[in-house]
């Protein structure tokens, strides 16, 4: 038998420095977690102790903090090289700055293979990107060989900016021939490493013949066997065992997100490359693990350039700004309310005595809110805090939509509720009631909107044929997160101001903020 240790990360989202327990900015260093310096300590400790170790990343290193805002991916290549990652799969966020923003800082600089079997380049891009990412890579591990085959969410064109010259194929369809090729080349230990979410990870384990292990990302899934060491609630045991269609037991793993944990999976293979056993758990990278001094020094050196962003206080919050995915993708969150209020405030235009304002409504995809802000840092809110919340460099735009389009959008918001997907809408100037006992597409039971043509704003039922103005992220205006109905049916679209700037201006204007959860989004069961 031959034993392989798979160390894995996913959805690190630019958390190069240690963070607080909720993955926002580190406030109390003695209680902080993660970061590449601490990760390196643990990785090196395991490499020294165990013979056959692979360090893998399942995508979405890009996007999430000021590090990416400033360094645009160069930081990812530099520190992943320093940690000596063995392979990385492309995530959807690797395309946030377009293909050029992937090629130049990361693909050309990485000293490790970057993988995706289901992304096919066409046109002039094909020759430009050729060889810079691969469908698979055969890696030497001790005296054995291991094949790693990559995959990326086929939803990426809806979630990011890959352009028109990359085709995202069905994962399973694309993976099978690559796995077959690896087997034909005598590679009998194959890991699927990718970024399509836990449900797809499980499907790959079930459907792709020859895959021995699946290491995933995208859904920030936390798996754990036994008592979990922090706040994350396990979605299942680690590893999660899937019985494949050909009767094999295939371990599937993911390691939450934000570099808080290091996935640790031990696999035992027989001489034919069959998995005999698998066990492990994510390792919580808490302060009991020291930060590596050399990596920490390097972080501090790179950090200097960021300090202009970090030091400027924009205003204060006297409440916790809950921007966690656990809240904002499931229910009204006060970070969503804050942002929407800022978006409306930024669009106050008293141009007509008949209207208190030309626009009263805001919608914001919960998945676009990427971090909370802890008030226990003297209440200070900085550019860096906001860059972690709104890392995408988008704009808040003005559109005109029919009521019927808005209704469709709110149905889409909850059509697959409960899977922590980003399309759950946060709102301003809207009161919505959902009944989740009803079938998808028929769950919005009440939708009231704030009047504009009124001296005293009040909420009235949405009219299907009326045209409304709405402030929303350009991401949604462009049909992102599956809001194709907005893109297809919008009657007018005017691009607006930079998202962080809108919120920072609002906070600076307000000086002290205390957004609440106030019943903008409600859930009910029964007749209406």
């Amino acid at each position: 038998a031959w034993e392989l240790t798979i160390l894995h990360t996913n959805d690190v989202h630019s958390r190069l420095e240690q963070t607080s327990e909720d993955s926002s900015k580190c406030v109390n260093a003695s209680r902080c977690m993660g970061g590449v310096a601490r990760l390196f300590t643990k990785v090196q400790q395991i490499r020294r102790a165990e013979p056959n170790v692979l360090l893998l990343d399942a995508g979405d290193q890009y996007q999430g903090t000021i590090w990416f805002t400033v360094y645009k991916g160069a930081e990812v290549a530099h520190f992943m090289n320093a940690l000596r990652y063995d392979a990385m799969a492309l995530g959807n966020h690797e395309f946030d700055n377009g293909v050029e923003g992937l090629i130049e800082p990361l693909l050309k600089e990485a000293k490790f293979p970057i993988l995706s079997a289901n992304i096919k380049a066409k046109g002039p891009l094909a020759s430009q990107i050729s060889g810079l990412y691969l469908p698979y890579k055969v890696l030497p591990v001790g005296d054995e060989v291991v094949g790693i085959v990559g995959y990326t969410s086929k939803e990426t064109p809806f979630l990011s900016n890959p352009g028109t010259n990359l085709v995202f194929e069905d994962e399973i369809t694309a993976l099978q021939p690559e796995v077959d090729k690896l087997k034909t080349l005598n590679v009998n230990k194959i890991i699927a490493l990718g970024h399509s979410g836990f449900e797809m990870d499980k499907l790959i384990a079930q459907k792709v013949r020859g895959v021995d292990v699946v290491v995933g990302g995208h859904s920030n899934t936390f798996l754990y066997t036994g008592n979990p060491p922090s706040k994350e609630v396990p979605a299942g045991k680690y590893p999660f065992i899937v019985t494949s269609d050909d009767g094999r037991k295939v371990p599937v793993v993911q390691a939450y997100a934000f570099g808080k944990y290091l996935g640790y999976l031990k696999i035992e293979f027989d001489e034919r490359g069959n998995v005999i056993s698998s066990h492990g758990n994510p390792i919580l990278l808490n302060s009991s693990i020291p930060e590596d001094p050399s990596i920490k020094a390097d972080i501090n050196k790179w950090r200097i350039k960021l300090d202009n962003y970090s030091t400027q206080e924009l205003g204060k919050t006297i409440v916790y700004l809950d921007g966690s995915s656990q809240s904002c993708r499931f229910r009204e969150c006060n970070m969503g309310n804050l942002i929407c209020d800022a978006m409306i405030n930024n669009n106050l235009r008293h141009t007509d005595e008949m209207f208190w304002n030309h626009v009263s409504m805001c919608i914001l995809n919960g998945g676009g809110i990427r971090s909370p802000i802890d008030e226990r840092n003297n209440g200070t809110i900085t550019w860096e805090n906001l860059a972690a919340v709104l890392p995408f460099g988008g704009t808040f735009d003005l559109v005109q939509l029919k009521g019927s389009t808005l209704k469709k959008a709110f149905e889409h918001s909850v059509h697959r509720y409960g899977q922590s997907t980003g399309e759950f809408l946060q709102v301003g100037g809207i009161h919505v009631v959902y009944d989740l006992s009803r079938k998808p597409g028929d769950r919005v039971v009440k939708l009231d909107v704030l009047c504009t043509k009124c001296r005293v704003p009040s909420y009235d039922p949405l009219k299907m044929d009326e045209v409304y103005k709405v402030i929303l992220p350009n991401f949604l205006a462009n049909g992102g997160d599956g809001f194709q109905m907005i893109k297809d049916e919008l009657l007018r679209h005017d691009s607006g101001d930079q998202d962080i700037n809108v919120v920072s201006t609002y906070i600076s204007k307000m000086k002290v903020i205390y957004p609440a959860v106030e019943g903008r989004i409600k859930f009910s069961t029964g007749s209406h």
Partner: antibody, heavy 125, light 110 residues
Framework: QVQLVQSGGGVVQPGRSLRLSCAAS????????MHWVRQAPGKGLEWVAV????????YYADSVKGRFTISRDNSKNSLFLQMNSLRDDDTATYYC??????????????????WGQGTLVTVSS | QSVLTQPPSASGTPGQRVTISCSGS????????VSWYQHLPGTAPQLLIY???HRPSGVPDRFSGSKSGTSASLAISGLQSEDEADYYC???????????FGTGTKVTVL
């Protein structure tokens, strides 16, 4: 030593069938993909088929697809090529060969590193 | 019809250097390693060289290989009479899902 010994060639009429065998020794047969390659008189080498180490994956050249079947018996260290609906243009010397993934440093090279002695198949009426 | 193209013949006098080219595409040479085989009449083909100059034991170092983009080449320096044979390049082809051989080059020692 590592060797592949072939058998089963001969003269056969068009439309008939023939089965070639290849006996392996000196290496762990079940760890290697195996190929069949042929050379028609006066022509170059033509790849025919491959089978993965465990027999689960098989690929064929377009010229033989649907007529030839590659198989293996790992318990007997044997490789086979079942040739049905033979045609005149299948006349060739057939070779079995071992597919080898060689590691040199961190680079892997794939080649056919061990070959059988060849067996002549003549399709003629 | 082979998808790897080689010149049909090459020749040289003893001691000379002979180079054989092998042209393919992104689905074979472009994305996979190349091997070269020597085939003497009446014998089985023999693996001669891997891409980037790696030779199996017993193959003299006057044989060298290289690859650039979608092409490969085999060089024989210090040509000897026993080098008279047919030479084939080969690579896995991802589009065809199979191993492909070149058209073959007959090397003659004058």
């Amino acid at each position: 030593q590592v060797q592949l010994v072939q058998s089963g060639g001969g003269v056969v009429q068009p439309g008939r069938s023939l089965r070639l065998s290849c006996a392996a020794s000196g290496f762990t047969f079940s760890s290697y993909g195996m190929h069949w390659v042929r050379q028609a008189p006066g022509k170059g080498l033509e790849w025919v088929a491959v089978i993965s180490y465990d027999g689960s994956i098989k690929y064929y050249a377009d010229s033989v697809k649907g007529r030839f079947t590659i198989s293996r018996d790992n318990s007997k260290n044997s490789l086979f090529l079942q040739m049905n609906s033979l045609r005149d243009d299948d006349t060739a010397t057939y070779y079995c060969a071992r597919g080898h993934l060689l590691r040199i440093g961190d680079i892997f090279y794939y080649s056919l590193d061990v070959w059988g002695q060849g067996t002549l198949v003549t399709v003629s009426s | 019809q082979s998808v790897l193209t080689q010149p049909p013949s090459a020749s040289g006098t003893p001691g000379q250097r002979v180079t054989i080219s092998c042209s393919g595409s992104s689905s074979n040479i472009g994305s996979n390693t190349v091997s070269w085989y020597q085939h003497l009449p009446g014998t089985a083909p023999q693996l001669l060289i891997y891409t980037n100059n790696h030779r199996p034991s017993g193959v003299p170092d006057r044989f060298s290989g290289s690859k650039s983009g979608t092409s490969a080449s085999l060089a024989i320096s210090g040509l000897q009479s026993e080098d008279e044979a047919d030479y084939y390049c080969a690579a896995w082809d991802d589009s065809l899902s199979g191993y492909v051989f070149g058209t073959g080059t007959k090397v003659t020692v004058l």
